[in-house]
């Protein structure tokens, strides 16, 4: 039975040209994590294999950095990076767990404007 849950950073926003950390955390299970896949819609961005470490997809190698931890850092953000991101935890004996993050990349002035009205 799959007892684990994935906690994510949820819905996040960032400035165009900036960077953002995507983070997921698997809890409430003793399952062994064998690999974490990071996907954007249907594109594979990177994987972290428990035995062999990080591998970044060739088409993203200039804009994606591994970590921190099992997270992923996206750099030089563009408006086209807006969308859904998924962390897929491959585990045994449980199987796969999937977490979802929605990233909105804003024009710099919009992001700054929005920041003034954030509630602490």
């Amino acid at each position: 039975m799959m007892t684990g849950t994935i906690e994510t950073t949820g819905n996040i926003s960032a400035e165009k040209g900036g960077s953002i950390i995507l983070q997921c955390h698997l809890s409430s299970t003793t399952a062994q994590v064998t690999q974490v896949n990071w996907e954007q819609q249907d594109q594979l961005l990177a994987i972290c294999n428990a035995d062999l470490g990080w591998h970044i997809s060739p088409s993203f190698k200039d804009r994606v950095a591994p970590g921190p931890g099992l997270g992923l850092t996206l750099q030089s953000l563009t408006v086209n990076d807006t969308g859904e991101y998924f962390c897929i935890y491959h585990t045994y004996p449980d199987g796969t767990y999937t977490g979802r993050i929605f990233l909105e990349v804003l024009e710099s002035s919009v992001a700054e404007h929005g920041a003034r009205f954030q509630i602490p």
Epitope: Q32, T34, Q35, N37, L44, I47, N49, A50, D51, L52, G53, W54, H55, I56, S57, P58, I88, H90, T91, Y92, P93, D94, G95, T96
Partner: antibody, heavy 121, light 107 residues
Framework: QVQLVQSGTEVKKPGASVKVSCKAS????????ITWVRQAPGQGLEWMGW????????NYAQKLQGRVTMTTDTSTSTAYMELRSLRSDDTAVYYC??????????????WGQGTLVTVSS | DIQMTQSPSSLSASVGDRVTITCRAS??????LAWYQQKPGKVPKVLIY???TLQSGVPSRFSGSGSGTDFTLTISSLQPEDVATYYC?????????FGGGTKVEIK
């Protein structure tokens, strides 16, 4: 098309070392891992270990730890497996294979033709 | 380490028969299991990965099922070209252990 071409037959004396090569073509070598599997005469398949051609990280079967070294040369898209202190029970056909780990399922989708290593005094 | 046990070790069946090979893991591995076919004197070839996903180009008479500890490879209608030894393999993380193999012959 994807191809893995291995070096030729080797005959070695007990205590010697052997280095088998596996030249890849038809895909981006550094985007995958290479695994090595051996098969003694009339026996089943034995996993020896694997290496990432992306970052060089390795993981070896426990029974071969200390005797085996796997390396890659991305400039020539070639993987190597060196086995030291050879014994008669190391006589086997040695296969390299490409590992598709992007899916998370670590299966071996393309195989080399095999290299027979005979250890005999 | 997780052990993989196949049964039977060999079998003989007639052309057109339905053939079933089983593989048992000593601990649960979800669906991280692959099946390989090795014809006499040839290189192994992947048939199925993720327990039930047919590799491209593999005939549809081959199918895989199971999850956790118990897995099955089925040949729905045995053909002469299916004479081979079949191996299961755990594919979650190292060691990527193979089962002992099942030799399939034609009666």
């Amino acid at each position: 098309q994807v191809q893995l071409v291995q070096s030729g037959t080797e005959v070695k004396k007990p205590g010697a070392s052997v280095k088998v090569s596996c030249k890849a073509s038809g895909y981006t070598f550094s985007s995958y891992a290479i695994t090595w599997v051996r098969q003694a005469p009339g026996q089943g398949l034995e996993w020896m270990g694997w290496i990432s051609a992306y970052n060089g990280n390795t993981n070896y079967a426990q029974k071969l730890q200390g005797r085996v070294t796997m390396t890659t040369d991305t400039s020539t898209s070639t993987a190597y497996m060196e086995l030291r202190s050879l014994r008669s029970d190391d006589t086997a056909v040695y296969y390299c294979a490409r590992v598709d780990f992007w899916s998370g399922y670590n299966y071996f989708d393309y195989w080399g033709q095999g290299t027979l290593v005979t250890v005999s005094s | 380490d997780i052990q993989m046990t196949q049964s039977p070790s060999s079998l003989s069946a007639s052309v057109g028969d339905r053939v079933t090979i089983t593989c048992r893991a000593s601990q649960g591995i979800s669906n991280y299991l692959a099946w390989y076919q090795q014809k006499p004197g040839k290189v192994p070839k992947v048939l199925i990965y993720a327990a039930s996903t047919l590799q491209s180009g593999v005939p549809s008479r081959f199918s895989g099922s199971g999850s956790g500890t118990d897995f099955t490879l089925t040949i729905s209608s045995l053909q002469p070209e299916d004479v081979a030894t079949y191996y299961c393999q755990k594919s979650n993380s190292a060691p990527l252990t193979f089962g002992g193999g099942t030799k399939v012959e034609i009666k």
